[in-house]
């Protein structure tokens, strides 16, 4: 606000006032009178730029007069009092109320003093973020969606991600006239590495004290990625039993594991136990390629592993005791 003038009366008011759609707002406006200065205010007037006539007048002898009596009210001005506070309350804010207003004091003998105030009509948006569940498409698709509904002015949406990708943001009219719904999609090429990772949608708006952060956990549906572990290339005869594990990453979860060999069904010394294959001790060398086939809703994938059980002196540190 401007500092009070020395030796002159000054109208004090903020340059901009925010108000919320449908709510009430006060446009503050005061006359600052230096200590020694005598002044007499006979009239307070509010008008809107670009419109003829006044929207609100308070006259020292006649009291208030409003263009819209149900929507306007002088907050402090009263008959029989010094008119120093022209603050005006507006009820039921509408989009079309946004604009520049002039608050004017008619003071004697100093003359008229006025100030302009910009009324911003805001609407606080509602924000949501949701995952867009996708499959491996090989091309960029939306994996997350962030929506800021019914904001005025439109909210500003940005994304934070370590996964790469790019935003695609669009606007559409909100439910209430003058409001805007902003929709932003986070787009990337889906991969299994993306599944379960998160991206953050950041929504900024004048009505927020601080930005709103909405985290989305991504979902990428993909067929099983399979590998077999548990073999260290160092198995020998007459040692303990060992275990091979079929490691599968998939979304949705695997529905079944099937063990076999390149020669067909499993040999007697290999026993399937779901994701694991138990290899019992053998008495002669073997050279067998095991196959683990994993199925989920999107399909089946398999991995192969060739296991050799070699002759050689058993030791504490070698053999089939890999588990």
């Amino acid at each position: 606000w401007p500092p009070p003038g020395t030796g002159d009366i000054v109208v004090q008011a903020p340059t901009q006032v925010p108000g919320f759609l449908g709510d009430s707002v006060t446009l503050p406006c005061y006359l600052q009178v230096p200590g020694m200065e005598e002044t007499h205010v006979s009239q307070l007037t509010w008008s809107r730029h670009g419109e003829s006539g006044s929207m609100a007048v308070f006259h020292q002898t006649q009291g208030p007069n409003y263009s819209e009596p149900k929507r306007l009210e002088f907050v402090a001005a009263r008959l029989g009092t010094e008119l120093r506070d022209a603050s005006l309350r507006m009820f039921g804010l509408r989009v079309e109320d946004e604009g520049n207003y002039t608050c004017l004091f008619v003071a004697f003998p100093q003359g008229s003093r006025s100030v302009d105030i910009w009324l911003r009509v805001l609407a606080k948006p509602q924000n949501t973020a949701e995952v867009q569940k996708v499959q491996l498409t090989g091309k960029p698709v939306p994996v997350a969606r962030c929506v800021s509904t019914g904001g005025r002015p439109p909210a500003h949406i940005t994304w934070h991600s370590d996964l790469g990708g790019m935003p695609n943001t669009s606007q559409a009219p909100g439910f209430l006239s003058g409001t805007v719904t902003v929709t932003s999609l986070w787009i990337l090429v889906p991969s299994s590495q993306v599944d379960g990772k998160s991206v953050t949608c950041k929504v900024e708006h004048e009505s927020f004290e601080k930005p709103q952060l909405l985290t989305v956990n991504l979902t990428v549906y993909y067929p099983p990625e399979v590998s077999i572990s548990g073999y260290d290339n160092n198995w020998y005869l007459s040692q303990n039993e060992a275990t091979l594990t079929c490691d599968a990453r998939s979304n949705p979860e695997p529905t079944g594991y099937n063990w076999s060999t390149t020669m067909g069904p499993l040999p007697p010394f290999a026993v399937a136990q779901g994701a694991q294959l138990l290899i019992r001790p053998v008495d002669k060398p073997i050279n067998t390629t095991f196959i683990c086939n994993v199925t989920n809703a999107l399909g089946a994938r398999q991995a192969e592993l060739t296991v050799q059980v070699k002759e050689g002196p058993p030791s504490e540190h070698s053999g089939m005791s890999s588990n």
């Epitope: 005598e38 006979s42 006259h59 029989g80 003998p109 100093q110």
Partner: antibody, heavy 121, light 109 residues
Framework: QVQLVQSGAEVKKPGASVKVSCKAS????????ISWVRQAPGQGLEWIAW????????NYNQKFTGRVTMTTDTSTSTAYMELRSLRSDDTAVYYC??????????????WGQGTTVTVSS | QAVVTQEPSLTVSPGGTVTLTCRSS?????????ANWVQQKPGQAFRGLIG???NRAPGVPARFSGSLLGDKAALTLSGAQPEDEAEYYC?????????FGGGTKLTVL
């Protein structure tokens, strides 16, 4: 047209009081500011006070505070100035003046014809 | 109380330009003094010309203009007419009271 018609000349003794009237016509009296000004023989003009006719709010020159009272009668659109404890140096022509407003500033717009007050023993 | 000083008399030729000034004993005249100018012709009532330093009263010819000139208030008459011959008074506002100048007798000759 706008007119201010003042009461006739007065002769008063020292220590007495005088009440001068100023009847307005041709404008909305209650929305006006009226100043009272005097001019002693061979002297310059001297501002006494102003009154806002609609409410009776006043502002007095400190020199006259306690001796002068300004009032209005809105029913007759008349302003009054009463000066008490008259002295010989109060002998002067007393004027009422309506302040006009240009939309930006005030000015001494219309003046009455003046009322001569003579204080003599 | 402040003293407001004007030129006692000035003369201007018909059609000529003349500037009447108004000095304050308290220092420079500013817009916060809301300088007023009134005219009084012989045998006639006072008439307001200027208010608030430079605002011409309705009906006042454009040849009259008010301003601040250096540290003084000024009334400039451009293209003087014989009927402009009169006494001109300056009035200044000092926070809570008006003070009148002594007046300038303007002769159009």
């Amino acid at each position: 047209q706008v007119q201010l018609v003042q009461s006739g000349a007065e002769v008063k003794k020292p220590g007495a009081s005088v009440k001068v009237s100023c009847k307005a016509s041709g404008y909305t009296f209650t929305s006006s500011y009226i100043s009272w000004v005097r001019q002693a023989p061979g002297q310059g003009l001297e501002w006494i006070a102003w009154i806002y006719a609609g409410t009776g709010d006043t502002n007095y020159n400190q020199k006259f505070t306690g001796r002068v009272t300004m009032t209005t009668d809105t029913s007759t659109s008349t302003a009054y100035m009463e000066l008490r404890s008259l002295r010989s140096d109060d002998t002067a022509v007393y004027y009422c003046a309506r302040h006009g407003y240009t939309g930006r500033g005030w000015y001494f717009a219309v003046w009455g014809q003046g009322t001569t007050v003579t204080v003599s023993s | 109380q402040a003293v407001v000083t004007q030129e006692p008399s000035l003369t201007v030729s018909p059609g000529g330009t003349v500037t009447l000034t108004c000095r304050s004993s308290t220092g420079a005249v500013t817009t916060s003094n809301y300088a007023n100018w009134v005219q009084q012709k012989p045998g006639q009532a006072f008439r307001g010309l200027i208010g608030g330093t430079n605002n011409r009263a309705p009906g006042v010819p454009a040849r009259f203009s008010g301003s601040l000139l250096g540290d003084k208030a000024a009334l400039t008459l451009s293209g003087a007419q014989p009927e402009d011959e009169a006494e001109y008074y300056c009035i200044l506002w000092y926070s809570n009271h008006f003070v009148f100048g002594g007046g300038t007798k303007l002769t159009v000759l």
